[in-house]
């Protein structure tokens, strides 16, 4: 699995999107963890419905709450009000018995509000993370960047 | 237990190389990165660089390109550290770490050290 | 690289007081930062990592807080067991980085 980075800005809401095959995984109950360092375990955050009919309703634990949309086969997942903290590596995955299958590996990086002038010093524009030579940057900023703004470049 | 063992302590002639060993028991190396760090004495820490024991892949901080080759064997399960042209400014304990990488690792297992004197 | 600086690189203080060791970033790592506690003739040990989490068997008398660029250590009713080098380390990018060290001492 290739890792996906989806950036978003400290104090907004981020949404973290995992597509999967909905015929293969028909039946079957998603999950959200976190991962504790890049091989490390994954502790489950939230997981669907128990009833997977019922999937379509959002569950919640704290500020994360995850919703599948079985027909269309995507498993979205809301991160609100993000933290530093909330940053790292995390996995969806489509459960079965007692295993779990990886639907996307996913790094979430929390980028400093442009905006907060409290913190004008942190402002962030990530350098090159040689982890990830190969990974895939979902930009979900929450807003659009103003005039002369420079966007944040991916992490490579 | 768990512990990672490494080979005694090294003295080497200026020019010459010498190949460190870091055994680890009571996990298998192939679930962790293996990281070597350099003290030189009453100085500071440096990493030196990573090896994913899983596949061989590996990463050398600039500084240590073509000073450093890490491998590892994981039969054994050992990592290896094999320093290159050895100078004065190599005298250092070499120490080698393992953890599950960046992010938020929750493990950290570091060896005793070994102590690499280089004479001239 | 990232640099990261760290001061002061020595600090003498009273058993029972609290220190403050601090890790300045050259650029925003996020709470990728851990802090390491090393005593003389021994290897690194790991006491904060993230930034602000505790290692496993960690005293609760240090605390570590901070994100993007600055960073604290805190020891709080200082032991004499806690007398050693401290190091911050950076864990967003590689290579990873240390600081110089805090050298602890007992006034």
């Known amino acids: 699995h290739n890792t996906t980075v989806f950036q978003g800005v400290e104090g907004q809401s981020l949404q973290v999107s995992c597509p999967y095959d909905s015929m293969k995984h028909w039946g079957r109950r998603k999950a959200w963890c976190r991962q504790l360092g890049e091989k490390g375990p994954c502790q489950r955050v939230v997981s669907t419905h128990n009833l997977w009919l019922l999937s379509f309703l959002r569950r919640r634990n704290g500020s994360t709450a995850i919703t599948d949309d079985t027909l269309g086969g995507t498993l979205t997942i809301t991160l609100r009000n993000l933290q530093p903290h909330d940053a790292g590596f995390y996995q969806c995955q489509s459960l079965h018995g007692s295993e779990a299958d990886t639907l996307r590996k996913v790094l979430v990086e929390v980028l400093a509000d442009p905006l907060d002038h409290r913190d004008a010093g942190d402002l962030w524009v990530p350098g090159e993370s040689e982890s990830f030579e190969d990974a895939h940057v979902e930009h979900s900023i929450s807003r659009s960047l103003l005039e002369g703004e420079i966007p944040f470049p991916p992490t490579s | 237990e768990v512990q990672l063992q490494q080979s005694g302590a090294e003295l080497v002639r200026s020019g010459a190389s010498v190949k460190l060993s870091c055994t680890a028991s009571?996990?298998?190396?192939?679930?962790?990165?293996i990281h070597w760090v350099k003290q030189r004495p009453e100085q500071g820490l440096e990493w030196i660089g990573w090896?994913?024991?899983?596949?061989?892949?590996?990463k050398y901080a600039p500084k240590f390109q073509g000073k450093a080759t890490m491998t590892a064997d994981t039969s054994s399960n050992t990592a290896y550290l094999h320093l290159s042209s050895l100078t004065s400014e190599d005298t250092a304990v070499y120490y080698c770490?393992?953890?599950?990488?960046?992010?938020?690792?929750?493990?950290?297992?570091w060896g005793q050290g070994t102590s690499v004197t280089v004479s001239s | 690289d990232i640099q990261m600086n760290q001061s002061p690189s020595s600090l003498s203080a009273s058993l029972g007081d609290t220190v403050t060791i601090t890790c300045h970033a050259s650029q925003h790592i996020n709470v990728w930062l851990s802090w390491y506690q090393q005593k003389p003739g021994d290897h690194p040990k790991l006491l904060i990592y993230?930034?602000?989490n505790l290692h496993t068997g960690v005293p609760s008398r240090f605390s570590g807080s901070g994100s993007g660029t600055g960073f604290t250590l805190t020891i709080s009713s200082l032991q004499p067991e806690d007398i050693a080098t401290y190091y911050c380390q950076q864990g967003q990018t590689y290579p990873r980085t240390f600081g110089g060290g805090t050298k602890l001492e007992i006034k």
């Open positions: 770490h393992a953890d599950h990488g960046n992010y938020g690792s929750t493990m950290d297992y």
């Open positions: 090896i994913d024991p899983e596949n061989g892949d590996s």
């Open positions: 993230k930034a602000s």
């Open positions: 009571g996990f298998s190396i192939e679930d962790f990165y």
